[in-house]
């Protein structure tokens, strides 16, 4: 609060210099409906632990996911799922009808993502849920499933 | 590296006050693959030439394009394909599938888009791929089709 | 214009110390194409009224919208559109082509986004049209649907 | 190192539907691409198609209604299947790996492993 | 899919230098970095010798350079040998996630 005006520390110490960012990609093989991430990719001021990225930060942060499905159709149609979880709990998912036709195809392609812009505290956790992890194609799109956030204002 | 505290100058030199973005709609006539756009877009510290986006200040990018398609169904399945091109290189896709009943239909729209967040280098270009570019309909949708990149954090 | 180099005062005018976002989500009961939005969701820097998000900091925003829809396919295709519009006018849209086989199926669910990368002025409206809102499924998806806004860069 | 061997009948009749296997040793077929390549007799090499170990596919836009590709990762070999074969589908058939490399990009090293190829005539 | 074009045929004396051309369009050599060189000896399977326009797989001699300016690819052999008759064949990656060879090129030692 208040007005610091020509006060050059005081206005510095709300300036947003921290910043935090990752961008991860799907992990090669997925075995469950809770994915799991590539620990190379771009990691800075927040943790990656088992599937979940880790925030050391408070503040605002941008957060979004984007998967590729491939879904050798049945006969019947399917939905698929992703959902964005902070602290284990579903904040939004993103839903989509593919094979609607119920006929038996090669293949269908899907996209789906989904982005949440919420205020998180130190050591809060962000995963990724996705009910049908078998469309996730990692062999032929190993680059197109990821993960990223970045903190867009740090808490004054 | 290290701690400059009450050092201002030291402070001020760190702090992310370069800006760089780029908001480009898609060219009226397209005749390639190759994306190409309207040069009177959105455009700080970011360069426009031959269809690519070029770098001027290195440091960690987001990069968003969304396209929407307008396809007249043939009496099979389309795979709509979005490529985010790096230096010449495919740096992640978006591909949907569409008129999957088979059934030629009127027309089906579909919107597709792909994200990237990246450390780019000066004089690095993103460029736009798609397979399906007649499909792309510039006379209804001048608008929609977009590339975009803004600087999150720029090198120190 | 002109380089301050080593003037901090003048320096630190320029930064983009000020910051403004927004993250609404879309109001239980909808009963017209312009969609409204929850006040009690995250705002700083941005006023909400009548559906409506409006600007007091002028600059360059990132502004995002994403809908997810719950259609009841009719025997005929269903088009979902959302737009995005500035003070009134249509800035951006996205459709997606639903029930495209024509025949009527339980339930399909699609997923539909929209950004823009935009300067805006002091008083500029950000509002979201949808022509079919009836498919926006407010008791299954009360987190899914969100409009969101933030400031990227001041103007100097 | 990694080795390919294809095998399959060396005369098919018309019409009929040529079936060719390549057998991969030295290496796992679910860690790569792998992709079909004919040759007519004095002719040009001419792409046909490519497999996933997942499954994926993609085909030569041109013979994209006759070829049918399926990996079988617990023998280690790709299959290709082209129907409605004429006396055109005359050639020497290759398997080969189509070596993808995503790191920071995706890398195309092209294809980097050929078997020796197997004649296939087509005739009554 | 349209073949890229090449030279029928190029020929040159031991020692000399030679380039074989490859021109494709906007939806495969001009768009990706992706093309590669084969050398094919009669009778034999193709062996890669450049990827990526101008990358060398370890084993190939130093002999053998790529490069690309828009829709055309090049493949340059300096000193040339006897052993490097063979037809030579290039390859692009296409738009519609395909590959799309040249319709090759005879090269003669004279």
């Known amino acids: 609060g208040g007005n610091c005006s020509e006060d050059l520390l005081c206005i510095l110490k709300r300036a947003p210099f921290k910043k935090s960012w990752a961008y991860l990609q799907v992990a090669k093989h997925l075995n469950k409906t809770k994915l799991s991430w590539n620990k190379d990719g771009i990691l800075h001021g927040v943790r990656y632990q088992d599937g979940n990225l880790v925030i050391q930060f408070p503040g605002l942060y941008f957060i979004i996911c984007q998967l590729q499905f491939l879904v050798q159709c049945p006969n019947n149609s399917v939905d698929l799922k992703l959902e964005l979880l902070i602290n284990k709990h579903i904040k939004k998912q993103a839903l989509v009808t593919v094979c609607e036709s119920g006929m038996q195809t090669k293949h269908v392609y899907q996209n789906l993502s989904q982005f949440l812009l919420d205020y998180l505290q130190v050591n809060t956790t962000v995963s990724v849920n996705v009910d049908t992890f078998q469309y996730i194609d990692t062999s032929t799109f190993p680059l197109e499933n990821v993960l990223s956030v970045f903190l867009y204002s740090n808490s004054d | 590296g290290g701690n400059c505290s009450e050092d201002l100058l030291c402070i001020l030199k760190r702090a992310p006050f370069k800006k760089s973005w780029a908001y480009l709609q898609v060219a009226k006539h397209l005749n390639k693959t190759k994306l190409s756009w309207n040069k009177d877009g959105i455009l700080h510290g970011v360069r426009y030439q031959d269809g690519n986006l070029v770098i001027q200040f290195p440091g960690l990018y987001f990069i968003i394009c969304q396209l929407q398609f307008l396809v007249q169904c043939p009496n099979n399945s389309v795979d709509l394909k979005l490529e985010l091109l790096i230096n010449k290189h495919i740096k992640k896709q978006a591909l949907v599938t569409v008129c999957e009943s088979g059934m030629q239909t009127k027309h089906v729209y579909q919107n597709l888009s792909q994200f990237l967040l990246d450390y780019l280098q000066v004089n690095t270009t993103v460029s736009v791929n798609v397979d399906t570019f007649q499909y792309i309909d510039t006379s209804t949708f001048p608008l929609e089709n977009v590339l975009s990149v803004f600087l999150y954090s720029n090198s120190d | 214009g002109g380089n301050c180099s080593e003037d901090l005062l003048c320096i630190l005018k320029r930064a983009p110390f000020k910051k403004s976002w927004a993250y609404l989500q879309v109001a239980k009961h909808l009963n017209k194409t312009k969609l409204s939005w929850n006040k009690d969701g995250i705002l700083h820097g941005v006023r909400y009224q009548d559906g409506n998000l409006v600007i007091q900091f002028p600059g360059l925003y990132f502004i995002i919208c994403q809908l997810q829809f719950l259609v009841q396919c009719p025997n005929n295709s269903v088009d979902l559109k959302l737009e995005l519009l500035i003070n009134k006018h249509i800035k951006k849209q996205a459709l997606v082509t639903v029930c495209e086989s024509g025949m009527q199926t339980k339930h399909v669910y699609q997923n539909l986004s929209q950004f823009l990368l935009d300067y805006l002025q002091v008083n500029t409206t950000v509002s979201v049209n949808v022509d079919t809102f009836q498919y926006i499924d407010t008791s299954t998806f009360p987190l899914e649907n969100v409009l969101s806004v933030f400031l990227y860069s001041n103007s100097d | 190192q990694v080795q390919l061997q294809e095998s399959g009948p060396g005369l098919v009749k018309p019409s009929e539907t040529l079936s060719l296997t390549c057998t991969v040793s030295?290496?796992?077929?679910?860690?790569?691409?792998w992709s079909w390549i004919r040759q007519p007799a004095g002719k040009g090499l001419e792409w046909i198609g490519r497999i996933y170990a997942s499954g994926n596919t993609n085909y030569n836009p041109s013979l994209k209604s006759r070829v049918t590709m399926s990996v079988d990762t617990s023998k280690n070999q790709f299959s290709l299947k082209l129907s409605s074969m004429t006396a055109a589908d005359t050639a020497v058939y290759y398997c080969?790996?189509?070596?993808?490399?995503?790191?920071?990009?995706?890398?195309?090293?092209?294809?980097?492993?050929w078997g020796q190829g197997t004649t296939v005539t087509v005739s009554s | 899919q349209s073949a890229l074009t090449q030279p029928a045929s190029v020929s040159g004396s031991p020692g000399q230098s030679i380039t074989i051309s490859c021109t494709g369009t906007s939806s495969d050599v001009g768009v990706y970095d992706y093309v590669s060189w084969y050398q094919q000896h009669p009778g034999k399977a193709p062996k890669l010798m450049i990827y990526e326009v101008s990358n060398r797989p370890s084993g190939v001699s130093n002999r053998f350079s790529g490069s690309k300016s828009g829709n055309t690819a090049s493949l340059t052999i300096s000193g040339l040998q006897t052993e490097d008759e063979a037809d030579y064949y290039c390859?692009?990656?296409?738009?519609?996630?395909?590959?799309?060879f040249g319709g090759g090129t005879k090269l003669t030692v004279l």
């Open positions: 390859s692009s990656y296409t738009s519609r996630s395909t590959w799309v």
């Open positions: 080969a790996r189509d070596y993808r490399v995503a790191g920071t990009y995706y890398y195309y090293y092209g294809l980097d492993v």
């Open positions: 030295g290496g796992s077929i679910s860690s790569y691409i």
